[in-house]
Amino acid sequence: KKVVLGKKGDTVELTCTASQKKSIQFHWKNSNQIKILGNQGSFLTKGPSKLNDRADSRRSLWDQGNFPLIIKNLKIEDSDTYICEVEDQKEEVQLLVFGLTANSDTHLLQGQSLTLTLESPPGSSPSVQCRSPRGKNIQGGKTLSVSQLELQDSGTWTCTVLQNQKKVEFKIDIVVLAFQKASSIVYKKEGEQVEFSFPLAFTVEKLTGSGELWWQAERASSSKSWITFDLKNKEVSVKRVTQDPKLQMGKKLPLHLTLPQALPQYAGSGNLTLALEAKTGKLHQEVNLVVMRATQLQKNLTCEVWGPTSPKLMLSLKLENKEAKVSKREKAVWVLNPEAGMWQCLLSDSGQVLLESNIKVLPTWSTPVQP
């Protein structure tokens, strides 16, 4: 008996061939001997089977002695033995229909679990192997689970169902809902405008939800909500914003926040959360703000940074085109009695400058100028 594997929702074509290469009488029946489809001369007839309006043939092949049974929009319960009767012969084909579905939704939040469930006909014993977009293989029986989904798991999962040495391949598109970056850091000189961007790592037709940015300033004892907003069909509307600082928010995606000026009291860490409609859980992105200030007070030139800096960052003070006068893995450096000229305060990571502030030191009879 020939075995054919089909996919739920797909179309399958079961073949039946006569030795005579011409249109002759044929019938397709199921295992209960109920007529599904056949011919009446040159015309198609259909029996009272449950397949009635989903069964078809290919009339153009009848003259060649081929009498296929085409079943569209396959259902698991279409799994059966189908018998083609032609020329006093019977050809039997066993059709096994499988379905593979993702647990509730194919749009999942980062960190959530993905469960793939195989629907199979009674009496079958298939094995399933799935390959994720990043090449990770998982194997299982009726269910396969992947915990802690990552951004790289977004894309097409290819799953192969194996039964009777035959295989059928399913492709499932999984979208991991996350921000493009888990964390970002912005370095700014005091007084500069700050732009925070929160690009999403996915695109959907309609995006609705609500969000909030909580901020923990380095100098503050507790965190506070800086802004709350709504998202309706990719349109952003601000619900509530603090008076200090008075953030501004872009009306379109990607989510975009503007802080009018970087000040030491704002330096710190924020957590933007986004709750999407019909989803349990929230998307998170951490954002950090480091602020630099260079000042000259009497005979002391000081450079300071506020905010979450890594211990390996180097803070330096140097006269332009000269070697650094002072370099320390600290958040403040100073030079006493600095020479006149353009001084640079640099925050760097392994030689790469992250933030730079210039201050002009005038001869002692002048007052300092800060560009």
């Epitope: 009446q40 029996g47 009272p48 009635n52 309006d53």
Partner: antibody, heavy 125, light 107 residues
Framework: QVQLVQSGAEVKKPGASVKVSCKAS????????MHWVRQAPGQGLEWMGW????????GYAQRFQGRVTMTRDTSTSTVYMELSSLRSEDTAVYYC??????????????????WGQGTLVTVSS | DIQMTQSPSSLSASVGDRVTITCRAS??????LAWYQQKPGKAPKLLIY???TLQSGVPSRFSGSGSGTDFTLTISSLQPEDFATYYC?????????FGQGTKVEIK
């Protein structure tokens, strides 16, 4: 219940083309073949061709080969019959028709149980 | 193509009469034959299929018989609503072909 609703009457000049539509409802559109039959004034019935709305396959009567095209739009459950290079003898009522089912649920494509109301196409200079 | 020949081409009868129309195929068509009734300005209506099976909703005064090449439609007792044109059609091979019609008129 099965309903086949055709487009309205048309007047065409010789050499022109006409496209008649037939909108089906009350059954699974892609499950059954659609046929076109015409009837010239005071004359008998003449079969023109068939279309399988599921696959888009077609078959035309020899005398209409090259002049008739049958198409479908599954999203609106509509079949179209276009006849080109019209001549005065193409003046007729054009019917769409589909096969019938008996009380046991057997379907016979070759017997036309359900018919559209007909579309009169007049070809005149 | 299979030729279908109906006779007579027209007949006059009275209400209550028994009417018989014949249809001959140019080659054997088993029992794959249908009969239709058509009234002026209307689409044909299927009366009988498979030579003798009455279509659902059709009055029992209509009956069909025959096999191979010769077929008959009989109206046992003609009613006023039966005055119409009747067509036979073979459903055995492509193209499906119709008889030229038999017009049943009031005497």
């Amino acid at each position: 219940q099965v309903q086949l609703v055709q487009s309205g009457a048309e007047v065409k000049k010789p050499g022109a083309s006409v496209k008649v539509s037939c909108k089906a409802s009350g059954y699974t559109f892609t499950g059954y073949y659609m046929h076109w039959v015409r009837q010239a004034p005071g004359q008998g019935l003449e079969w023109m061709g068939w279309m399988n709305p599921n696959s888009g396959d077609t078959g035309y009567a020899q005398r209409f080969q090259g002049r008739v095209t049958m198409t479908r739009d599954t999203s609106t459950s509509t079949v179209y019959m276009e006849l080109s290079s019209l001549r005065s003898e193409d003046t007729a009522v054009y019917y769409c028709a589909t096969g019938g089912s008996d009380s046991s649920g057997y379907y016979y494509e070759g017997y036309f149980q359900h018919w559209g109301q007909g579309t009169l196409v007049t070809v005149s200079s | 193509d299979i030729q279908m020949t109906q006779s007579p081409s027209s007949l006059s009868a009275s209400v209550g009469d028994r009417v018989t129309i014949t249809c001959r195929a140019s080659q054997t068509i088993s029992n794959w034959l249908a009969w239709y009734q058509q009234k002026p300005g209307k689409a044909p209506k299927l009366l009988i299929y498979a030579a003798s099976t009455l279509q659902s909703g059709v009055p029992s005064r209509f009956s069909g018989s025959g096999s191979g090449t010769d077929f008959t439609l009989t109206i046992s007792s003609l009613q006023p609503e039966d005055f119409a044109t009747y067509y036979c059609q073979q459903a055995n091979s492509f193209p499906p072909t119709f008889g030229q019609g038999t017009k049943v008129e009031i005497k």
